[in-house]
């Protein structure tokens, strides 16, 4: 058993049929010595008396808010949550496996630049009685500070018969050094509590590996005289690290016909313009990627050819 | 070239070669996630590689003030990786074909380090750890870790030379 926060405790249980469970001793936080009784949740049934209560925690029915009273007055509470371990593996019932970039990916994170700011998100089908708490650091043995905000519900989607809820959190490294080569990964830890179930999820990454620039901005076309060619131009996204002579991007320009089956013409360039042939009913799209490190491409910025 | 008196390197040449290094490093080990290398036991592996750290003056301001600190750090790293890529970590099994980008990577690391340090001038170099794994799986794991680490190192070096070529070239 360990303390998650004040008056909230997590009991770690090996979860299998007829498991013996864990013996837990609760102590009433009071100077009083006698006349103390204990109850669980809203029930008025007295579970025991005395300053301490010993219970055998085996299942969710044994978890909940234990309260000690004296003469009708509440003295203190202890909320017991369960953390299940099945076949040596901690349960992951609360969050959905996003399976990208690999199986058992529950947290996904992205950064728009090298400033040390990043966003993580996760998915669940649970809509109520759900709380999250997020902590982060750079490195684990001698951790350096990363400050995370509160997790918020950022999207709701309907998937088949189910509703899916996306939560996200923003974090900022306290003393970020955008130009340095990271040697210690960022660690993100999410505590999830659904009713009386506790689970924790972690992710470990370098900012450089989760970089995904915003799409290029101000995408414009300039027809070239007496030609089917156009000059496409664009700018670095506002959110990208500066100076651009140091934090450089590379770009992919694509001409795509109306039908998805039509052949795509692609050009790669380090410049912020390119000359391409504009076909009727086609569109021109540009996306960006760090020039020197192959992290994710941005989403496409697009304009119609006409 | 970064000569003893502290004059400028051939920024544009360094820029071109460092960008080629980035491409080669990703050709040699293109996959980011086919195995989570940090999960695979980090004890004596690549913790000793020289990293370009915050105080090494490789940021735009530091380069403007005095690029020598940064160039020395980059040179140190290039020599370190060049020695690793020439070691039995890369020559033993699993077998690399002669067309492997590792060969070109090795030659290009040497080429860039020579651009930075002409003959007769010696910056101190970091000792390369004596890693000689006997099993193919240990060697392969180490290869992947070294290449992932090299990708990060050459990305910073390439940014330095791109910025230098754009803002510090005579």
């Amino acid at each position: 058993i360990w303390e998650l926060k004040k008056d909230v405790y997590v009991v770690e249980l090996d979860w299998y049929p007829d498991a013996p469970g864990e013996m837990v001793v609760l102590t009433c936080d009071t100077p009083e010595e006698d006349g103390i009784t204990w109850t669980l949740d809203q029930s008025s049934e007295v579970l025991g008396s005395g300053k301490t209560l010993t219970i055998q925690v085996k299942e969710f029915g044994d978890a909940g808010q234990y309260t000690c009273h004296k003469g009708g007055e509440v003295l203190s509470h202890s909320l017991l949550l369960l953390h299940k371990k099945e076949d040596g593996i901690w349960s992951t019932d609360i969050l959905k496996d996003q399976k990208e970039p690999k199986n058992k990916t529950f947290l996904r994170c992205e950064a728009k630049n090298y400033s040390g700011r990043f966003t993580c998100w996760w998915l669940t089908t649970i809509s109520t009685d759900l709380t999250f708490s997020v902590k982060s650091s750079r490195g684990s043995s001698d951790p350096q500070g990363v400050t995370c905000g509160a997790a918020t519900l950022s999207a709701e989607r309907v998937r088949g018969d189910n509703k899916e809820y996306e939560y996200s959190v923003e974090c900022q490294e306290d003393s970020a050094c955008p130009a340095a080569e990271e040697s210690l990964p960022i660690e993100v830890m999410v505590d999830a509590v659904h009713k009386l179930k506790y689970e924790n999820y972690t992710s470990s990454f370098f900012i450089r590996d989760i970089i995904k620039p915003d799409p290029p901005k101000n995408l414009q076309l300039k027809p070239l005289k007496n030609s089917r060619q156009v000059e496409v131009s664009w700018e670095y996204p506002d959110t990208w690290s500066t100076p651009h002579s140091y934090f450089s991007l590379t770009f992919c320009v694509q001409v795509q016909g109306k039908s998805k089956r039509e052949k795509k013409d692609r050009v790669f360039t380090d410049k912020t313009s390119a000359t391409v042939i504009c076909r009727k009913n086609a569109s021109i799209s540009v996306r960006a990627q760090d020039r020197y490190y192959s992290s994710s491409w941005s989403e496409w910025a697009s304009v119609p050819c006409s | 070239r970064a000569v003893p008196g502290g004059s400028s390197p051939a920024w544009t040449q360094c820029q071109q070669l460092s960008q080629k290094l980035c491409t080669l490093a990703w050709s040699a080990h293109p996959l980011v996630g086919h195995m989570d290398l940090r999960e695979e036991g980090d004890e004596e592996t690549t913790n000793d590689v020289p990293h370009i750290q915050c105080g090494d003056g490789c940021d735009p301001q530091g380069l403007r003030d005095n690029s020598q600190f940064c160039l020395q750090r980059i040179h140190q790293g290039l020599i370190f990786y060049e020695k690793l890529l020439g070691s039995d970590i890369f020559t033993g099994e699993p077998s690399l074909l002669p067309d492997s980008p590792v060969g070109q990577l090795h030659a290009s690391l040497l080429g860039l380090s020579q651009l930075l340090q002409p003959e007769g001038h010696h910056w101190e170099t970091q000792q390369i750890p004596s890693l000689s794994p006997s099993q193919p799986w240990q060697r392969l794991l180490l290869r992947f870790k070294i290449l992932r680490s090299l990708q990060a190192f050459v990305a910073v070096a390439a940014r330095v030379f791109a910025h230098g070529a754009a803002t510090l070239s005579p």
Partner: antibody
Amino acid sequence: QVQLVQSGAEVKKPGSSVKVSCKASGYTFTDQTIHWMRQAPGQGLEWIGYIYPRDDSPKYNENFKGKVTITADISTSTAYMELSSLRSEDTAVYYCAIPDRSGYAWFIYWGQGTLVTVSS
Amino acid sequence: DIQMTQSPSSLSASVGDRVTITCKASRDVAIAVAWYQQKPGKVPKLLIYWASTRHTGVPSRFSGSGSRTDFTLTISSLQPEDVADYFCHQYSSYPFTFGSGTKLEIK
């Protein structure tokens, strides 16, 4: 896109020789090794060897040394595999293939195969 | 030479079944193992490399696992178009060697 086109099927007498060609296109011929494999009827694959056109250096499976000669003609982007002293057990489909660019020998592109039949 | 012992040599399964083919290397090959699919009269097609990395365009029902000496190719839900021969291949050590193949049929 990368393509490997092999010469047509051959029927040969025991003791004779055969030269199979593999014309490459869609990439820089001198940049990559070209490998040869064979597959006897109803059998698995056997790796014969490769040539690296850039330095014209072949490497052979010891089991095929003296039996096989692998060469390359840079001017036509073509690799060749010559089999000598043919015996009935050399009857097989012979494939050329090129590996991944990362320098390890898993094979992405294959020729269509050339059936060599050795029969008296 | 490294021997790649592949089993079973043939197997018959129903559409939707989970199918597993194994390969045992005679010594440590790290994860330098690829798997190929060869349909009758066709050339081998790369499915998996580095023991578990799916090649571009290969359906997600194909997966590979294993390291050092023991390797597995799994088809999570067999489809009619998966009827073929399957080969494992080690590229750790010269001469590169292949398993003897597994002929997969639909019941």
